[in-house]
């Protein structure tokens, strides 16, 4: 094959080599960029900056090598469009520093920075940590800071990420209230801070106020949906990023729903309960307290992390005709109580009749659901019976 006269020449099926002295000052308009998986650049003294726009369209790039060139600055977001990048060799350039943000979000198996005039500062604390933890092949490079000795020896006692404290209201929060949160940020070299509110959706009207070092957030007209939702304060400095999440507990009264009994490895009377704080539960069977045992007990399903409602079953492992009847679930918290009842029939009575049992003459409709604000026993809905004396 004839030698390639261009600044950059194909290498293998999806590679590109750019080694002609001084031919590049940026990476714009590289041929076949969208399919490249490997890019090798050498001897490009005019290539001094690597920025977001330089690597746009290189979405398949896995290996990037820029060596023996004039690179002195890599933007924190330079690799935003190359999420598959796994090997990055920037050795023998003019880099004094490299932001932690540059490699954040990448799964780098290899990062080579040897031969650069690195300047030891807190901004390289992340790289020192990689060296300590044996990441990316960094320890083998024995990185040096220009005129300052090994990177490993850099003092780091003062190199911390920001410290965050989020103040939430002590008092009980009710539906419709306005809630003020404040995030206090401390630390050196603070760069940016803010709130992450992606979980909130329709839970409240949001108003942000203030800036570093004290950020305010007002959640106006809160709803019960705010419960279990994370409100996150974040801040960044040259060392890294810190986040603190809090949740606001919005009080609301207990509610309960019962559903028709289903056979699920024995029997289950499904229920849903809601309320903040979480309500206490009590079962009644035909109006009397039902004591739970290993064969009749409440079992909750795994709760969803972001909601207060709990789903579960009253498990009846071996119900017979004696378990047929009216089941009531009572739920209560300091803000209210609720009940729901359902008729369940698991098995027909195998005996024609027992002289000591009442003979049912009329029943409430099967699977009657009732939900009310208070547990109420409705006397007119209970089945009545006729006792028969047998001589």
């Amino acid at each position: 094959a004839a030698p390639c006269p261009d600044a950059c020449c194909p290498h293998g099926s999806s590679g590109l080599r750019c080694t002609r002295d001084g031919a590049l000052d940026s990476l714009h308009h590289l041929p076949g960029a969208e399919n490249l998986t490997e890019l090798y650049i050498e001897n490009q003294q005019h290539l001094q900056h690597l920025e977001l726009r330089d690597l746009r369209g290189l979405g398949e790039l896995r290996n990037l090598t820029i060596v023996k060139s004039g690179l002195r600055f890599v933007a924190p977001d330079a690799f935003h469009f190359t999420p598959r990048l796994s090997r990055l060799n920037l050795s023998f350039n003019a880099l004094e520093s490299l932001s932690w943000k540059t490699v954040q979000g990448l799964s780098l198996q290899e990062l080579v920075l040897s031969g650069n005039p690195l300047h030891c500062s807190c901004a390289l604390r992340w790289l020192q940590r990689w060296e300590e933890e044996g990441l990316g092949g960094v320890p083998e490079q024995k990185l040096q800071c220009h005129g300052q000795g090994p990177l490993a020896h850099m003092p780091n006692a003062s190199c911390g990420v920001p410290t965050l404290k989020v103040q939430v209201p002590n008092a009980s929060v009710d539906v419709g209230d306005d809630v003020l949160l404040r995030c206090q940020v401390e630390g050196r070299g603070l760069e940016q801070a803010g709130w992450i509110l992606t979980e909130l959706e329709q839970s409240a009207t949001v108003m942000k106020s203030g800036g570093l070092p004290s950020l305010g957030l007002t959640l106006a007209n809160v709803t019960s949906d705010l419960n279990r939702k994370n409100v996150t304060c974040w801040a960044e400095n040259d060392v890294g990023r810190a986040e603190v999440s809090v949740q606001v507990n919005v009080s609301f009264p207990a509610s309960v729903q019962l559903h028709t009994a289903v056979e699920m490895h024995h029997w289950c009377i499904p229920f849903s309960v809601d309320g903040q704080p979480a309500p206490s539960l009590r079962w009644l069977f035909n109006g009397s307290v039902l004591n739970e045992t290993s064969f009749i007990f409440t079992e909750f399903l795994e709760p969803a992390a972001n909601e207060t409602v709990r789903h579960g079953c009253l498990r009846l492992n071996q119900p017979t005709h004696v378990n047929n009847g009216n089941y009531t679930l009572l739920a209560a918290n300091p803000f209210g109580q609720a009940s729901a009842s359902i008729m369940a029939a698991f098995m027909d009575n195998p005996f024609e009749f027992n002289p000591e049992d009442p003979i049912p003459v009329s029943f409430s409709p099967v699977d009657t659901n009732s939900t009310s604000g208070d547990p109420v026993e409705k006397k007119d809905e209970t089945p009545f019976g006729v006792s028969v004396a047998v001589g």
């Epitope: 024995h266 045992t293 409440t298 079992e299 909750f300 498990r315 071996q318 004696v322």
Partner: antibody
């Protein structure tokens, strides 16, 4: 696989107390009831009570109600049965057994408690 | 308490025999469960919910019954079946066991 491993044999004096442990592995401890059953030498099986680690609910056999205490430590998936004011007729092998939807699916290997002056 | 009475209390039989053990409850129970115990060992679940075989239990074992009367049957005794058998109710507190039936080699 599911394992219930009980503490070792105990020799106690009348009037003393004994605490037997049952360490669970191979399943979600809080999802199953734990039963305690004892068997005196040459005798049948006697149910002492049950505990639900999920909420600490206990049901005791009336016969032992004033002398037995069942507890759990969910952080180490372990159930305990303490029997106080021991008498010579408490000499027995004490078993733990777990149940969820079916009775006593798996049993511990048993702990021999001897009460003798 | 629900009393469970097993009969016979002990029985001698030979390999290949068909054996039936009964368990009578003092009041109606929905289901009966059966356990096998060998000397020095913990009981092992044999049959649950009256007629369901526990995992790994050979099909020569079967259970039946309802109300107050239940039966455990071994269709053709094998040497490893010589043990003590207990019935158990799981319908009311306290849970109770039968006094046991000791099955010996004739």
């Amino acid at each position: 696989q599911v394992q219930l491993v009980q503490s070792g044999a105990e020799v106690k004096k009348p009037g003393a107390s004994v605490k037997v442990s049952c360490k669970s592995s191979g399943y979600t401890f809080t999802n199953y009831w734990m039963h305690w059953v004892r068997q005196a030498p040459g005798q049948g099986l006697e149910w002492m009570g049950e505990i639900y680690p999920n909420n600490g609910r206990v049901n005791y056999n009336e016969k032992f109600k004033n002398r037995v205490t069942m507890t759990v430590d969910i952080s180490i998936s372990t159930a305990y049965m303490e029997l106080s004011r021991l008498r010579s007729d408490d000499t027995a092998v004490y078993y733990c057994a777990r149940s969820r939807y079916d009775p006593m699916e798996d049993w511990g290997q048993g702990t021999t408690v001897t009460v003798s002056s | 308490d629900v009393q469970l009475t097993q009969s016979p209390s002990s029985l001698s039989a030979s390999v290949g025999d068909r054996v039936t053990i009964t368990c009578s409850a003092s009041s109606s129970v929905g289901y009966m469960h059966w356990y096998q115990q060998k000397p020095g060992k913990a009981p092992k679940r044999l049959i649950y919910d009256t007629s369901k075989l526990a995992s790994g239990v050979p099909s020569r074992f079967s259970g039946s019954g309802s109300g107050t009367d239940y039966t455990l049957t071994i269709s053709s005794l094998q040497p490893e079946d010589f043990a003590t058998y207990f019935c158990q109710q799981w319908s009311s507190i306290p849970l109770t066991f039968g006094q046991g039936t000791r099955l010996e080699i004739k």
